[in-house]
């Protein structure tokens, strides 16, 4: 008689990443008997919730349920029914909700309340919705990429599983760019982390890690753009803002009330003699770069060295994975290749920003104009942040790897978050049982 395959003994987990500009649902899967092994959890599905981030529903919280329906239904379809009740669901909200909470704790609580009620209606094991800290966001992103790269495994492999993987156990640093915040996380080389707020200690798989992390609230690409506009309109002579970060020929009317809606622009707020102003693109990379640099205060540093705004940053060490919007923007601009030097990236950005808006619209007809119009700014911002903000150089640029997925799983904080909450990263190295790592295929 033929051998019948035994039913898969697998487990599933769901994490919703409620970001400032959108929400994504991730479904993870792993063999039940290998929970403590490194690298066994993988992503089986990403469902991007259709619409903006949850913080935008503050005036219509009763509609959050509709907004989440489609992706929760997708989870119901992907995960076998027999597994529904034991599948944990976690929702973590990031900087968009941190900003809303700064404005009104009550409103932020109301949004999370409705999110919790909506998610509790599904047959899964809902574990709660919360606003994660910037420190957690950085730390979990770092755990995710190093877990997927196999950096926590004690067994050195003779092969590489991803193109940029070095064969040693040196961890990768993590660079995460969102819409409202950006995180930098890495293990510095024998360096004291001078500010306790930026220090994390982990013991993972029997090894100790002293990790530096910082999250810069308001320095995600969308909030950085609002900051830049608020700063530049202060010195505009009238309601026309000639902006080097937008393509020549581009025009857009901005409401002053929208500009000052976010806490991120409070420091630039002033009474203006107009309710609206018009952005007129002039498409000049160099001037755009200069304007962005004015958002980084580098005149004050109470430590041996800083990133910007008086925030401690140790000397950069090792390779870095740059993901989320770092990747999406650079991918759109076709600048993710390992072979592209920093000088080449700058050159390409100069050309891209100088292209007329009408030409850009024709070349990228399938892209929404709002997104399309902001790639010049976003690309320039990424260069400014990495070079002047974090002190990467033309030489160390080659240590930045723009990563979308590793082994089919998205780079980001969600996997690390789930691994932590399901206790799947042991402090000590698990005792290896014969063949438990599928040594023989």
């Amino acid at each position: 008689t033929q051998n019948k395959a035994l039913p898969e003994n697998v487990k599933y987990g769901i994490v919703l990443d409620a970001g400032s500009s959108h929400t994504s649902l991730y479904i993870y899967k792993w063999p039940a008997e290998k929970e403590n092994d490194t690298g066994v959890v993988h992503q089986v599905e990403e469902c991007r919730v259709k619409g903006p981030g949850i913080s935008k529903f503050v005036q219509k919280v009763n509609e959050i349920g509709i907004y989440l329906t489609d992706c929760m239904e997708r989870a119901r379809e992907v995960i076998p029914r027999s597994q529904h009740q034991e599948t944990p669901v976690y929702l973590g909200a990031t900087a968009g909700m941190r900003l809303l909470r700064m404005e009104s704790e009550e409103l932020a609580d109301r949004v999370l309340d409705v999110v919790e009620r909506s998610l509790s209606n599904y047959p899964f094991d809902f574990q709660g919705a919360r606003i994660i800290t910037g420190q957690e966001e950085g730390a979990y992103g770092w755990i995710t990429i190093n877990y997927l790269l196999g950096k926590f495994s004690q067994k050195t492999r003779w092969f590489s599983i991803v193109p940029y993987e070095t064969n040693n156990q040196e961890t990768f640093g993590a660079l995460d760019l969102g819409g409202a915040s950006t995180q930098v996380t890495f293990v510095p080389q024998n360096q004291t982390i001078e500010s306790p707020d930026n220090a994390l200690q982990f013991r993972l798989y029997g090894k100790d890690y002293n990790v530096y992390t910082h999250s810069f609230l308001c320095y995600g690409k969308d909030q950085a753009l609002w900051q830049k506009l608020a700063k530049d309109i202060q010195v505009a002579s009238n309601e026309i803002l000639r902006d080097p970060c937008f393509h020549p020929g581009y025009k857009k009317v901005v409401n002053v009330s929208d500009l000052y809606k976010t806490p991120c622009t409070k420091r630039f707020e002033m009474t203006l003699p107009f309710q609206q102003f018009e952005i007129q693109g002039i498409g000049n990379y160099q001037q755009c770069h200069q304007s962005i640099l004015e958002l980084f205060n580098t005149s004050y540093c109470p430590y041996s060295q800083c990133a910007f705004n008086g925030i401690f940053l140790p000397p950069l060490q090792g390779d870095f994975g740059a993901f989320s919007a770092f990747y999406f923007v650079m991918k759109f601009l076709n600048l993710t290749s390992e072979k592209v030097s920093q000088e080449k990236v700058t050159e390409m950005m100069k050309k891209f920003c100088a292209q007329p808006w009408e030409e850009i619209k024709t070349s990228y007809a399938g892209v929404k104009e709002k997104y399309l119009s902001e790639y010049c700014f976003s690309g320039t911002y990424i260069l400014s942040l990495l070079l002047q903000g974090y002190h990467f150089t033309a030489d160390s640029w080659e240590h930045i790897h723009f990563i979308g997925k590793i082994q089919g799983s998205d780079a980001g904080w969600t996997l690390g978050y789930m691994l932590n909450l399901t206790n799947m990263i042991p402090a000590e190295q698990p005792l290896s049982t014969p063949l438990s790592h599928s040594t023989y295929v």
Partner: antibody
Amino acid sequence: EVQLVQSGAELKKPGASVKISCKVSGYSFTDYNLNWVKQAPGKGLEWIGNIDPYSGGTRYNQKFKGRVTITIDQSTSTAYMELSSLRSEDTAVYYCGLYGYDDDANYFDDWGQGTLVTVSS
Amino acid sequence: EIVLTQSPATLSLSPGERATISCSASSSVSYMHWFQQKPGQAPKLWIYATSNLASGVPARFSGSGSGTDYTLTISSMEPEDFAVYYCQQRSSYPLTFGGGTKVEIK
């Protein structure tokens, strides 16, 4: 402003296949699911299926499964619905549509103008 | 699949009269959406998420309900309101529509 423009009317013989297109503009193509709905003459509305251009994932109504294929061409922001093994009861107007929340959390629902498919020998 | 049953199938009214259309679901849904359709036109979203009027829909329209029973009400019929109305659930797949209610002039 979101626009969905469908291909023109089709006359097909029983047993043949038909492929209808729906070109979208005014938004980022990967942002929303694209749905297909059938309306036979003088009858009600029937959901056929949808596609998520972001992931490429499709869902079909069991009633049409096996005969319908929904695809997309991201380069032209166009969705297609192909119906095979046509029979007379497939004579209908077919609509493409999308719905969801825009960047300001306003709900919207937009439909194409419809494509009449006539199945007749 | 969730079956939606609309009643009545036809409603004959005069301008100024009140119209009430019901939609009953075979199992509980979180929200109901309503569409208006006129001859030769694509359906138009009229009420979304049970009670929210779509853009441009007059205030004489209202929606209510929960669970399995939902209602669309027109407080005082105007000539342009005579059309076919469909309910639709988007809570679970496959998405389903009610059979429609034709509101005609008496």
